[in-house]
Amino acid sequence: HTAAQDNCTCPTNKMTVCSPDGPGGRCQCRALGSGMAVDCSTLTSKCLLLKARMSAPKNARTLVRPSEHALVDNDGLYDPDCDPEGRFKARQCNQTSVCWCVNSVGVRRTDKGDLSLRCDELVRTHHILIDLRHRPTAGAFNHSDLDAELRRLFRERYRLHPKFVAAVHYEQPTIQIELRQNTSQKAAGDVDIGDAAYYFERDIKGESLFQGRGGLDLRVRGEPLQVERTLIYYLDEIPPKFSMKRLTA
């Protein structure tokens, strides 16, 4: 376990409580909210992070057109149910017994129903499109430099295997990062694209989940890359099931 040995903290998740009570007096960290032990050498799952957040005191050079089945997280924050591995349970319900089905990144993919609603399986989000607009700069970023820095960021900060960053598109001032990861491609120990995207989203908002004081410092050939808008689209292996009423609203 790689929580810092002396002051016993979790480098990859500040929303933890750590103490030297692991085997051999090693540092062990547990996520706030759920109390689940977390592996501080990798990203914590989005489900456990959302749960911790809810428990915390409140204070081609062409751009991709998201498919008709792409989901955007319009519902915002909720206190999720996580399984023993820290993944989202397929069915989520609130305190008033309103239930809905979610995908592997916790985004609602059905209409809301009651306790009789069935969600047979957790549907995997296999394609994530991160759409960014950067603040004005003296000139456009060099596309290959931008591509290299964003790939490096996902590989080194978010520990995502390089093969899962499918593409980086750029048409000033819009940047799009495509992450793709099928169930069959994801090996044991691989970071999930949904978790990487969530860490990135929080970093971009200046709400870093890492222990560090510094936050994300993203630069392209020394020029700071500052993001003013972020939209994230989620594509599931099975299209979502919404009523026509919602689709025409």
Partner: antibody
């Protein structure tokens, strides 16, 4: 060009202290985790310590814990290794190396030329 | 702590031969493995990271494979300039342990 230059090595008696430095240039030092690696004469590579890009996290190999301290000054683009209570087995060439981008743990893509530390009475 | 075991510790091969070096982690480390080359009297040089990604500027005769606990470095056609000691290293988390090294010589 991207460069790391170590300094401060030398001969020191057992039980004494020494501080080695590593000056970085050609890249944005404050965005990279940094490491110290050592190599005893005729032996293999041994990782010694890491400090994250923002100084928020440090880790050490068991054999130096409590004796060595890694630190950095991002305003000076410099990495340090303070070595106290030195022992004969600490004799080695000490390399600084660049690690992860906005992180700590990653492969080392840039190495310094090394500085020799000899612990002997 | 996770141990990294390299084999063989040394080998001798002819120019043009295919050379394979293996590295085994005592526990799974996903793809967080690097390979380095150190020529006599020189500084180590990164060859491969993330188990199989070739570092920029490294000749394509070098390749890496594996995931989890078993990893391989292959030199498809050994050249005289490849005489060196090769090290694997895990970098999933601290300690970032190196393997013991494999010394490659020309017959």
């Amino acid at each position: 060009q991207v460069q790391l230059v170590e300094s401060g090595g030398g001969v020191v008696q057992p039980g004494r202290s020494l501080r080695v430095s590593c000056a970085a240039s050609g890249f944005i030092f404050s965005t990279y985790g940094m490491h110290w690696v050592r190599q005893a004469p005729g032996k293999g590579l041994e990782w010694v310590a890491v400090i994250w890009y923002d100084g928020s996290n440090e880790d050490y190999v068991d054999s130096v814990k409590g004796r060595f301290t890694i630190s950095r000054d991002n305003s000076k683009n410099t990495l340090y290794l303070q070595m106290n209570s030195l022992r004969g087995e600490d004799t080695a060439v000490y390399y600084c190396a660049r690690g992860g981008y906005n992180s700590g743990w990653w492969a080392f893509d840039v190495w310094g030329q090394g500085t020799l530390v000899t612990v002997s009475s | 702590d996770i141990q990294m075991t390299q084999s063989p510790s040394s080998l001798s091969a002819s120019v043009g031969d295919r050379v394979t070096i293996t590295c085994r982690a005592s526990q799974g480390i996903s793809h967080f493995l690097a390979w380095y080359q150190q020529k006599p009297g020189k500084v180590p040089k990164l060859l491969i990271y993330a188990a199989s990604t070739l570092q920029s500027g490294v000749p394509s005769r070098f390749s890496g494979s594996g995931s989890g606990t078993d990893f391989t470095l292959t030199i498809s056609s050994l050249q005289p300039e490849d005489v060196a000691t090769y090290y694997c290293q895990k970098f999933n988390s601290a300690p970032l342990t190196f393997g013991g090294g494999t010394k490659v010589e020309i017959k």
